[in-house]
């Protein structure tokens, strides 16, 4: 009985619980189209259980798959502006190490002001993922239209 | 030690695996932004598991980071009609207790007749989340076209 | 020492950790709206782990609650095109066994070039999931625009 | 079994007013959302006006725009369409019409009409 | 605004022939397209929504076809009892607007 009871256990910290939400901090310096990151229970409701920052960038701790998200929304933008200003377009991808680089999701803005989107992908240890906004406008940093999350899912 | 080690484990009924999937019932009166959800088998698809309707708008029974998405369609919709009403916004947040009011997730439809997005969040047991649409256009009731759901991931 | 072990196994197979990301092999014949999917690690980060391909439709192996996400990019596509073109719907449904034949997510591209939602849904060992694409346009294959999965969430 | 039945009509003259009223039964009419159609003598349908299931959003065809109002009452699950500055071309039979539940769309149900007739 | 046309204006058919009525839309309105059926002093009646879906009650006789911007009522062997004027609308975006309809007669 002991036994078969033992068998529902599940020692928390094996689940491989890492998961992350970031929200923006800054866009990059000119020629650098990456958007740097920030995330921490001090700034609001973003948050690192596992993964960890490197220099705005999201480096992963555990192999598995993950959950990829995002949500970028343009600041000062209409359907006009959107259009006048195309090709703004969000791309997320592995970027260091420079081996496994790839792009895992990408998404133009055509005529809207933001983009949402999400998939699963197999993530490393060391895996570093960037998200590059290409394009003259300008992301919103409101939380709760720019933000920037993944989570793992399985081994 | 028997202890220290008991504390390691997590009965698998114990997971948390909280979740609910709503489809529309209705919109608010007049000066009320809220759309109402309603969920359970015999409406179809939708169910809640762990997570509670409390007119209309979900209640959240235990902490923890969850994964918050919604699919918003504007019926009788066309770009023309959707940027011709535009501004019509979609906002997802806690409402209640009021001491942790807050914005989660914010679209705008611009010329476009659907906002589908997704977030990780923190929520705690007792926050209710209201999903406000404001603007003149209705939500298609449509169970394919409107939902909202949430998905606990962690503690 | 057996039974200390027995306490921190769960096997991963009864997790049902089943999961299947796929990217866009091909289109159907005329007068077949589907969209054909394929996946394997030989064709970059697609795979399926648990769900199974059927003349490149998922095949579900596990009852549960799953989290089914999409994302598809028309090829060849600008605002002007995807609104000339309109209308062009995207839906994912159960097409298999008939019985339980039912639309899960649908969304239209209006002025947009790219569509992605998600929703929580309950699905049965046997279920095929179909998604149709329905309008003269053309995705893209590219599989970082394209792409389709399912993550097993709870029984 | 729905019903809709519609009172209020009648004969006035030019610019002046007139409420009509369409009381439902057989189905929750607080979660359905209704419009007004007419047609003039002897022509075709004319979309007029349509109100959301909580009255929270109304629309309205341009021909009738800031002069006609609809409202309802869902406690009396009643639908009302205040008619002022009324001119001759807006004679009719008036038919109260639901919406079907999914999409605010076409009028799965309708009523038998009331006739409105504008003339000096 | 939509503007949908209906041809014939008239139509006489035969008794158990087939009636085949057809509306235009000036641009497209996906399947959003419902038929009525208005018989002389009475209210309409809905009988196809999303351009191919028969509303409740309806006999099979009836069908609808089409999406875009051309659509088919059919039906396909007339009763005495379908002499009455049809009418389509769309419903994909407002003002919602209504063909002028069609006269069904037997011949």
């Known amino acids: 009985q002991r036994f078969a009871q033992a068998q529902q256990q599940l020692p928390l910290e094996s689940l491989g619980w890492d998961v992350a939400e970031l929200q923006l901090n800054h866009t990059g310096p000119q020629q650098d189209p990456r958007l740097y990151w920030q995330g921490g229970p001090a700034l609001g409701r973003s948050f690192l259980h596992g993964p960890e920052l490197d220099k705005g960038q999201l480096r992963i701790h555990r192999d598995g798959i993950y959950m990829v998200h995002i949500q970028v929304t343009l600041a000062i933008c209409s359907s006009t502006t959107a259009s006048r200003h195309h090709p703004t377009t969000l791309a997320v991808g592995i970027c260091s190490p420079a081996s496994r680089s790839i792009s895992l999701l990408r998404l133009s803005f055509h005529q809207g002001c933001t983009i949402a989107s999400q998939r699963l992908t197999p993530l490393a240890r060391g895996d570093t993922l960037c998200t590059n906004l290409t394009g003259t406008l300008l992301p919103s940093r409101n939380t709760d239209e720019t933000f920037f999350g993944v989570q793992w899912v399985r081994p | 030690q028997r202890f220290a080690q008991a504390q390691q484990q997590l009965p698998l009924e114990s997971l948390g695996w909280d979740v609910a999937e709503l489809q529309l019932n209705h919109t608010g009166p007049q000066q009320d932004p809220r759309l109402y959800w309603q969920g359970g088998p015999a409406l179809g698809r939708s169910f809640l598991h762990g997570p509670e309707l409390d007119k209309g708008q979900l209640r959240i029974h235990r902490d923890g980071i969850y994964m918050v998405h919604i699919q918003v369609t504007l019926a009788i919709c066309s770009s023309t009609t959707a940027s011709r009403h535009h501004p019509t916004t979609l906002a997802v947040g806690i409402c209640s207790p009021a001491s942790r009011s807050i914005s989660l997730l914010r679209l705008s439809f611009h010329q476009g007749c659907t906002i589908a997005s997704q977030r990780l969040t923190p929520l705690a047991r007792g926050d209710t989340l209201c999903t406000n649409l404001t603007g003149t256009l209705l939500p298609s009731r449509n169970t394919d076209e409107t939902f909202f759901g949430v998905q606990w991931v962690r503690p | 020492q057996r039974f200390a072990q027995a306490q921190q196994q769960l096997p991963l197979e009864s997790l049902g950790w089943d999961v299947a990301e796929l990217q866009l092999n091909h289109t159907g014949p005329q007068q077949d709206p589907r969209l054909y999917w394929q996946g394997g690690p030989a064709l970059g980060r697609s795979f399926l782990h648990g769900p199974e391909l059927d003349k490149g439709q998922l095949r579900i192996h596990r009852d549960g609650i799953y989290m089914v996400h999409i994302q598809v990019t028309l090829a060849i596509c600008s605002s002007t095109t995807a609104s000339r073109h309109h209308p062009t719907t995207l839906a994912v449904g159960i097409c298999s066994p008939a019985s339980r034949s039912i639309s899960l997510l649908r969304l239209s591209f209006h002025q947009g070039c790219t569509i992605a939602s998600q929703r929580l849904t309950p699905l049965a060992r046997g279920d095929t999931l179909c998604t149709n694409l329905t309008g003269t346009l053309l995705p893209s294959r590219n599989t970082d625009e394209t792409f389709f999965g399912v993550q097993w969430v709870r029984p | 079994e729905v019903q809709l039945l519609e009172s209020g009509g009648g004969l006035v003259q030019p610019g002046g007013s007139l409420r009509l009223s369409c009381a439902a039964s057989?189905?929750?009419?607080?979660?359905?959302?209704m419009s007004w159609v007419r047609q003039a003598p002897g022509k075709g349908l004319e979309w007029v006006s349509t109100?959301?299931?909580?009255?929270?959003?109304?629309f309205y065809a341009d021909s009738v725009m800031g002069r006609f109002t609809i409202s309802r009452d869902n406690s009396k699950n009643t639908l009302y369409l205040q008619m002022n500055s009324l001119r001759a071309e807006d004679t009719a039979v008036y038919y109260c019409?639901?919406?079907?539940?999914?999409?605010?769309?076409?009028?799965?149900?309708w009523g038998q009409g009331t006739l409105v007739t504008v003339s000096s | 605004e939509i503007v949908l046309t209906q041809s014939p204006a008239t139509l006489s058919v035969s008794p158990g022939e087939r009636a085949t009525l057809s509306c235009r839309a000036s641009?497209?309105?996906?399947?959003?397209l419902a038929w009525y059926q208005q018989k002389p002093g009475q209210a309409p009646r809905l009988l196809i929504y999303?351009?191919?879906s028969r509303a409740t009650g309806i006999p099979d006789r009836f069908s609808g076809s089409g999406s875009g911007t051309d659509f088919t009522l059919t039906i396909s062997s007339l009763q005495a009892e379908d002499v009455a004027v049809y009418y389509c609308?769309?419903?994909?975006?407002?003002?919602?607007?209504f063909g002028p309809g069609t006269k069904v007669e037997i011949k």
């Open positions: 999303g351009a191919s």
């Open positions: 109100i959301s299931d909580s009255g929270g959003s109304t």
């Open positions: 609308q769309q419903y994909y975006s407002t003002p919602f607007t």
């Open positions: 019409a639901r919406h079907d539940y999914s999409n605010y769309a076409f009028f799965d149900y």
């Open positions: 057989g189905f929750t009419f607080s979660t359905y959302a």
């Open positions: 641009q497209s309105v996906s399947s959003n």
